[in-house]
């Protein structure tokens, strides 16, 4: 049992005068004063690894990570980031200390991640692992939640690798569905990373920064809860940590529990158990299957079997890429204006989306719920029976998809009317789109109900407001019309409404505005 | 050089609210892996945890207190701020601040400490 | 809340010999436990975590055992300057922290 080596990792801040990349070096820069990494043994593990706190660097500052070393005689080191070897030459300093400095300049996204420094010295061989990120508002990203066994222990630690970092809570609900809402009083958060009671019915993780909340539930399979429909699906990307949580009570601890991939028993090491007594002295006992990393051969059907249980399954599909399935062809509605309608769009997608609805140009906040049988549904009512276009559009991360609406409310014509010196117009917005009549009001027909034959050019549908179809009609003055009277009028299934125009005035004057239903 | 220190007044008064200032130098609050944490020691008797929080703002608190602790970080990044309300002969105590370091996956609890304030409590 | 019980509470032992201090966790603490070292009027000094690593700078005679629920703390040969309290802290269910009552060392 020797004394090992005294370390200390130390992370010097420098004032840039100079850019290049990581440079193994004592290179000499104006700098702030050391400040402590907490390098301290990693416990545990296998060789001697020293970890230093993570450091997060603004773009473009310049920093040294260094290390010294209170250990007799020479060192040989080696750095290693992302898989290539850099040159490291160690020093001595006035208190004999080894000293080896590793200098990143002008800090850009590509020299973020895991810095390796293996030291060999005459008495022992051991490793320092630096981790650095980028702090840059400009940078700020939120991930999803991922699940890690913590080591050596039955919990579960919750990380995000978000920047700036997250504050990380686990939630909590022992019932079932509906009043496992987020705000409810079944709900339980624990704002902490590592969670020990892994018992509950429902776990998920949240975290949230600067740019809002993201969460990842832990997938589970109950063996007391009647089997889905449809076979629960899980979605991965190829690299990403699978957690499965199969869950089973009985009256006494006379079970087991057994996980299965396509009817081969997991490795060992990839599965753990825990049981516990619940309050009424029955047993539950939960299985974790786990892979760190998915491959593509991770793919398959995973059955958890207990020997007091129907079995259950779950289908585990591994991809490349993420993926947002829906139909995208536009969709056309017609309701009437106090009838209650949502639009709703059903999709299946990994990673989960995040997504908006607009109209007029406005985005409205996107709820979206999951369905029994692996898909999504997100509905959106706000429409307040306002006719126009409006549009989904969801993405995350790897795929987007947009798909277009149009509402059409059924109601009779409302016209405007305005004259120039050479016409008249009118135009209206009912639906269905309205027909034009246009009469003229004189001696002989006080009541205007003598029919204007010429000069009339109708444009249906030719401007589009946000979507919303109007339709104009337009009279071109003869010098005989001119002082006269004259009535436009738009009809559909729903009504009629017509405005009374004064030919040769310079504006509109709704002398009169008829409603004949 | 990591060093703590701990400042704060010496006597209190029973119903007042206790205010400490923990001053850090030699490594970084805005380093996204390190925390402070408060616990003190009545004269004679065992370590007692109260409170902590990481650079990232995330905080806890000793459920026994609860209700009477606030920690936040000072207005220099160098220093965390403890009150604790409602005073009681019973919180006479030394009062230390220490260091936390959290990695990915693992803790290294209290590395360094600060030399600790006596803090009576007394009418 | 996870109690931690120490014993024995006080420990006399000669210059020169084996020192075992034990401590008891309520619960399993797994293998987060660590040992403080406190001398009068000073802050206490971490000594070991992780239930058997060693902190920086901590020489080799102490050394730690044990995981779950029952761990020691052993000085193979004790010097005049490890005579102090001993505390053992369970940082299992972080970011709740808790420490046994203590052990005091004393000269034999």
């Known amino acids: 049992n020797q004394d090992l080596p005294v370390i200390k990792c130390v992370l010097i801040n420098h004032k840039n005068n100079d850019s290049s990349v990581g440079k193994s070096s004592s290179y000499p820069m104006v700098s702030e004063s050391p400040e402590d990494l907490g390098c301290a043994l990693r416990p545990q593990s296998a060789g001697t690894v020293y970890e230093a706190a993570t450091v997060e660097v603004d773009v473009s500052a310049s920093i040294t990570l260094q290390v010294l070393v209170d250990t007799p005689g020479n060192i040989s080191c080696l750095w290693v980031f992302k898989h290539s070897s850099l040159n490291c030459q160690p020093h001595f300093d006035v208190q004999n200390r080894g000293v080896v400095s590793m200098v990143i300049l002008k800090m850009t996204e590509t020299q973020a991640g895991e810095y390796l420094l293996f030291i060999q010295s005459e008495a022992t061989n051991y490793t320092i692992v630096f981790t650095v990120s980028i702090r840059n508002t400009l940078l700020f990203t939120l991930r999803r939640p991922y699940f890690r066994k913590m080591e050596n222990q039955d919990a579960l630690v919750c990380i995000s690798e978000s920047v700036p970092e997250p504050i990380v809570e686990w939630v909590l609900c022992d019932s079932q569905g509906e009043s496992c809402k987020e705000e409810s009083p079944a709900v339980v958060k624990k704002e902490e990373k590592v969670l020990h009671e892994l018992f509950g019915t429902d776990i998920r993780c949240c975290a949230r920064n600067e740019l809002g909340r993201e969460c990842t539930r832990l997938f589970t399979i109950d063996l007391n809860q009647t089997p889905q429909t449809t076979l629960p699906q899980l979605f991965l990307k190829v690299g990403e940590p699978l957690w499965i949580r199969c869950k089973a009570v009985h009256v006494n601890h006379g079970f087991g529990l057994t996980w299965e991939l396509e009817n081969k028993a997991l490795e060992e090491g990839s599965y753990f158990e825990m049981s516990t007594y619940s309050t009424n002295r029955t047993m539950i006992r939960i299985l974790f299957a786990f892979v760190s990393s998915v491959a593509r051969n991770d793919t398959g059907y995973y059955t958890c079997s207990s020997s007091k249980h129907p079995s259950q399954s779950a289908l585990v599909t591994i991809v490349e890429k993420g993926f947002i399935n829906a139909t995208n062809s536009s969709e056309d509605y017609e309701i009437d204006q106090y009838e209650e309608f949502c639009f709703s769009v059903r999709f299946k997608a990994y990673p989960q989306i995040r997504c908006t609805w607009t109209f007029s140009r406005k985005a409205f906040p996107c709820e979206q719920k999951a369905l029994d049988d692996g898909y999504s549904v997100s509905k959106f009512c706000n429409h307040k029976h306002q006719p126009g276009e409006y549009i989904f559009h969801a993405e995350n991360g790897d795929a987007q998809f947009t798909k277009m609406f149009t509402l059409n409310i059924r109601r009779k014509p409302q016209v405007l009317a305005e004259a120039s010196a050479s016409q008249a117009s009118c135009s209206s917005d009912g639906y269905p789109l309205p027909s034009w009549t246009w009469k003229k009001c004189s001696d002989k027909s006080p009541n205007c109900t003598e029919d204007i034959p010429e000069g009339v050019w109708n444009r249906k549908a030719n401007r589009k407001v946000f979507g919303q179809w109007v339709s104009s009609s337009t009279l071109n003055m003869s010098e005989a019309m001119k002082g006269f009277l004259v009535k436009c009028c738009a009809y559909n299934s729903l009504g009629t409404s017509c405005e009374t125009i004064l030919l040769n005035s310079p504006g509109p004057f709704p002398f009169i505005q008829d409603s004949i239903s | 050089q990591v060093t703590l220190k701990e400042s704060g007044p010496v006597l209190v008064k029973p119903t007042e609210t206790l205010t400490l200032t923990c001053t850090v130098s030699g490594f970084s609050l805005s380093n996204a892996r390190m925390g402070v944490s408060w616990i003190r020691q009545p004269p004679g008797k065992a370590l007692e945890w109260l409170a902590h929080?990481?650079?990232?703002?995330?905080?806890s608190y000793s459920p026994s207190l609860k209700s009477r602790l606030t920690i936040s970080k000072g207005t220099s990044k160098s220093q965390v701020v403890l009150t604790m309300t409602n005073m009681d002969p019973v919180d006479t105590a030394t009062y230390y601040c220490a260091r936390i370091v959290g990695y990915v996956d693992w803790l290294l609890p209290f590395d360094y400490w600060g030399q600790g304030t006596l803090v009576t409590v007394s009418s | 809340e996870i109690v931690m019980t120490q014993s024995p509470a006080t420990l006399s032992v000669s210059p020169g010999e084996r020192a075992t201090l034990s401590c008891r966790a309520s619960q399993s603490v797994s293998s987060n436990l660590a040992w403080y070292q406190q001398k009068p009027g000073q802050a206490p000094r971490l000594l070991i975590y992780g239930a058997s690593t060693r902190a920086t700078g901590i020489p080799a005679r102490f050394s730690g055992s044990g995981s779950g629920t029952e761990f020691t703390l052993t000085i193979s040969s004790l010097q005049s300057e490890d005579f102090a309290v001993y505390y053992c802290q369970q940082y299992n269910n972080w970011p709740m922290y808790t420490f046994g009552q203590g052990t005091k060392l004393e000269i034999k």
């Open positions: 929080i990481f650079s990232n703002d995330e905080r």
